[in-house]
Amino acid sequence: FERTRSLQDPCSNCPAGTFCDNNRNQICSPCPPNSFSSAGGQRTCDICRQCKGVFRTRKECSSTSNAECDCTPGFHCLGAGCSMCEQDCKQGQELTKKGCKDCCFGTFNDQKRGICRPWTNCSLDGKSVLVNGTKERDVVCGPSPADLSPGASSVTPPAPAREPGHSPQ
């Protein structure tokens, strides 16, 4: 079948990195600068992606593969193939339509992207709060109160200045 196809269509012999040049009797010509073909049998080469503005080149374009972009520091990629750069926030914040805003009490974000999420509700698992939650960190759940031997208590570090820091009930 491949042999039959190549007899019918000389372009099928053109490898990746070349194109079948109709202007030159359908011979295989190398892709021009700043273009590529990732598969064989192409009649044209695709223009290389240019990483400009807040986009940085993560991988250079070659004759057989497109360039890949990421984002300049302070931004992160969104979408397939990094189609958009979104501004980072600090840990303990989330990006809103009005910019980076601190997580509300009872929520946290331990990354520079994404939204603030509620602290774990330890009591739902029958556990107690071992370490208080903050804007940047989830609570740490400890053993259930019943698991503690008489006279023993869970160690609770000093609460952060801004928050009394118990799990929301």
Partner: nanobody, 122 residues
């Protein structure tokens, strides 16, 4: 032809001021958020400030807060960046950009200017 053009750069002494301007031709700046970026020699491009299209809300990088002020004049089709109390760390090429969505999201086909050089030195 659609383009952005920065102006107002130059050499200034530490502690001095400069006012950069971003002008548009071929489209209305009033329809876009306008952001300022800068790139110092050998460093990555850095977001500096942005002014929204809708309510002219302004946002600033921590490094320039209290020193830089961004404003827009839709009648003149310009956005200005007033830079006060400049230090050598502010030396860079300054670019304006017009993101299609808002101050916090950027695409490859956004409009960008060619940049204007700001040098802070005694």
């Amino acid at each position: 032809q659609v383009q952005l053009q920065e102006s107002g750069g130059g050499l200034v002494q530490p502690g001095g001021s400069l006012r950069l301007s971003c002008a548009a031709s071929g489209f209305s700046l009033g329809l876009y958020a306008i952001a300022w970026f800068r790139q110092a020699p050998g460093k990555e491009r850095e977001w500096v400030s942005c002014i929204e299209k809708s309510d002219s809300s302004a946002y600033y990088a921590d490094s320039v807060k209290g020193r830089f002020t961004v404003s827009r004049d839709n009648a003149k089709n310009t956005v200005d960046l007033q830079m006060n109390r400049l230090s050598p760390e502010d030396t860079a090429v300054y670019y304006c950009a017009a993101p299609q969505s808002d101050c916090f999201h950027y695409k490859e086909n956004d409009y960008w200017g060619q940049g204007t050089q700001v040098t802070v030195s005694s």
